[in-house]
């Protein structure tokens, strides 16, 4: 019997300072570019080496970005989301959702809060 794959979803506020080459990541998603089935949310698809996001270290590929400077990213066209980031200013606050894959055994698996493996 195979183990079950579960996901641990957490949210985090990430404050980035725009670097010389910008924020340093790519996005996918939007109402006209659904990257995840039945979800028009905005996701991080690429973290650029030595960019602001990479140097900060918290934003990860696969993260869902929920808001930028308090502005919700729900129901946006892809290009509108891109423009929102580009016009977000020097100090940018991102509310992000991390989705961590947790491999659980078929029986008697430990809870996710148990640090012992």
């Amino acid at each position: 019997m195979n183990g079950r794959v579960d996901y641990l979803v957490t949210e985090e506020e990430i404050n980035l300072t725009r670097g010389p080459s910008g924020l340093g990541f790519n996005i996918v998603g939007g109402t006209d570019q659904q990257y995840v089935s039945n979800d028009s949310g905005i996701y991080v698809s690429r973290i650029k080496e030595n960019g602001a996001a990479a140097l900060d270290g918290r934003l990860q590929e696969g993260d869902k970005i929920l808001s930028v400077n308090g502005q919700d990213l729900k129901n946006l066209l892809h290009q509108d989301a891109v423009d929102l980031f580009r016009n977000a200013g020097y100090a940018v606050s991102l509310r992000v959702q991390h989705r961590l894959q947790v491999q659980n055994g078929p029986i008697g698996h430990r809870g996710e809060g148990d640090p012992s493996g």
Epitope: N26, V28, Q33, H78, V82
Partner: nanobody, 129 residues
Amino acid sequence: QVQLVESGGGLVQAGGSLRLSCADAASGRTFSTYTMGWFRQAPGKEREFVAHINWDGSNTYYADSVKGRFTISRDNAKNTMYLQMNSLKPEDTAVYYCAAAIGSTVDSYRHSDPLEYDYWGQGTQVTVS
């Protein structure tokens, strides 16, 4: 995983035309999220930017040397990008590479920077005599 394969290169006389294709043999439905470009490299020279296209084809950008002669396009239903090359010149002789990055940069476009792209094809030779 992304697997870009170019085709359509060959030998053509000056003034002639060629159409290059770049297909992703592996992506499936994610192709439509790629930002893509064409680059070329002539013997003894550095890799040179040729053209760029955004995810849905609504935004294109060209090097000055090919503007008005080359046209970049894409068909997301076929997982393929194209480069229509007209009025070819001997100086267009090079190996042509397609490149892709997943998603759109949230920063100012730097289409011509190879570091903006994560995935590259193996190249197709274009020779203009």
